[in-house]
Interface confidence: low
């Protein structure tokens, strides 16, 4: 399955939207910074394409879930958020099309399941952090920066998959 070129462009647009969503200075929130333990090793280049597609799908699905809550709607600009949803939705569609075409469905390696679980746990830590911080503006800013970072890392994986074809 070939991810379309538009998928790559969509990833860049997503990053740009995340950058534009900034509402307050991250510098005023340095004390709120937190290491969420992004499971970087689950996005290593050692993966086969069949294993990466579902992990990337999970990553984007979790971002979508995180930013679709009512707390998120209250924190961010509605117009930017709508554009953000659209980009994520399109990327989910691209990845789902790959899964439907048979990539990653013939076998479900345990390693892949572990990777999906690691991504879910990562987002659970982010959700817990937001709850503990009572969804404060600084907490959301820290999370926005973190998602931008982790999404960027997963985008790099997509690019490396494309270049290996």
């Amino acid at each position: 399955c070939d991810l379309p070129q538009t998928h790559s462009l969509g990833s860049r647009r997503t990053l740009m939207l995340l950058a534009q969503m900034r509402r307050i200075s991250l510098f005023s929130c340095l004390k709120d910074r937190h290491d969420f333990g992004f499971p970087q090793e689950e996005f290593g280049n050692q993966f086969q394409k069949a294993e990466t597609i579902p992990v990337l799908h999970e990553m984007i699905q979790q971002i979508f879930n995180l930013f679709s809550t009512k707390d998120s709607s209250a924190a961010w600009d509605e117009t930017l958020l709508d554009k953000f949803y659209t980009e994520l939705y399109q990327q989910l569609n691209d990845l789902e099309a790959c899964v439907i075409q048979g990539v990653g469905v013939t076998e479900t390696p345990l390693m892949k399941e572990d990777s999906i679980l690691a991504v879910r746990k990562y987002f659970q830590r982010i959700t817990l952090y937001l709850k503990e911080k009572k969804y404060s503006p600084c907490a959301w800013e820290v999370v926005r920066a973190e998602i931008m970072r982790s999404f960027s890392l997963s985008t790099n994986l997509q690019e490396s998959l494309r270049s290996k074809e």
């Epitope: 200075s25 340095l30 290491d35 960027s152």
Partner: antibody, heavy 118, light 107 residues
Framework: QVQLVQSGAEVKKPGASVKVSCKAS????????IHWVRQAPGQGLEWMGW????????GYAQKFQGRVTMTRDTSTSTVYMELSSLRSEDTAVYYC???????????WGQGTLVTVSS | DIQMTQSPSSLSASVGDRVTITCRAS??????LNWYQQKPGKAPKLLIY???SLESGVPSRFSGSGSGTDFTLTISSLQPEDFATYYC?????????FGQGTKVEIK
């Protein structure tokens, strides 16, 4: 394409002030921070501070507090860095840099050499 | 302030060599570590951000790893255009600080 164009080289006497400009183009000016970093001849890089292009907020390294002022002109997408009470050890190339977020810089100005000499 | 210590301060290598530069932070900086390349008379150029993310347009022979206090920049196969000075930078807390630099010279 993204560009940061800085003002030309300056020669100043000790005790004087210098104001270096950094004109941004090719991106939405208000969406990104501009940071200033300097480099003395043959030395490493030293971070000076940041300017929020949107709000005008600033943050300076303690070392430069009281001597540095960063401002911006949104109408021309230009950021300024003024350093006062210059001394010989301020002789350096001053760079402005566009921050992607969280402290990394994807674009830099070409640098402005400021020489402080009596 | 967080101190960043790079090693070695300089190294000589040949085209095709695998080169490793290390950077150590005086306290944990999570993965807020960036690598820059600088050539004489030029502005620094971003190579790696967030410890291991390759900046767009940077050749894949460059890679970064590490978390916490210890980080590594690796050039898998040194090319003629890679002879330059490399700096690590922490962006965990202000003042952001750079390592002293590692000069990669031709053997």
């Amino acid at each position: 394409q993204v560009q940061l164009v800085q003002s030309g080289a300056e020669v100043k006497k000790p005790g004087a002030s210098v104001k270096v400009s950094c004109k941004a183009s090719g991106y939405t000016f208000s969406n990104y921070y501009i940071h200033w970093v300097r480099q003395a001849p043959g030395q490493g890089l030293e971070w000076m501070g940041w300017m929020d292009s949107n709000s005008g907020g600033t943050g300076y390294a303690q070392k430069f507090q009281g001597r540095v002022t960063m401002t911006r002109d949104t109408s021309t997408s230009t950021v300024y860095m003024e350093l006062s009470s210059l001394r010989s050890e301020d002789t350096a190339v001053y760079y402005c840099a566009k921050e992607v977020f969280s402290g990394w810089y994807d674009y830099w100005g070409q640098g402005t050499l400021v020489t402080v000499s009596s | 302030d967080i101190q960043m210590t790079q090693s070695p301060s300089s190294l000589s290598a040949s085209v095709g060599d695998r080169v490793t530069i290390t950077c150590r932070a005086s306290q944990s900086i999570s993965s807020y570590l960036n690598w820059y390349q600088q050539k004489p008379g030029k502005a620094p150029k971003l190579l790696i951000y967030a410890a291991s993310s390759l900046e767009s347009g940077v050749p894949s022979r460059f890679s970064g790893s590490g978390s916490g206090t210890d980080f590594t920049l690796t050039i898998s196969s040194l090319q003629p255009e890679d002879f330059a000075t490399y700096y690590c930078q922490q962006s965990y807390s202000t003042p952001y600080t750079f390592g002293q630099g590692t000069k990669v010279e031709i053997k």
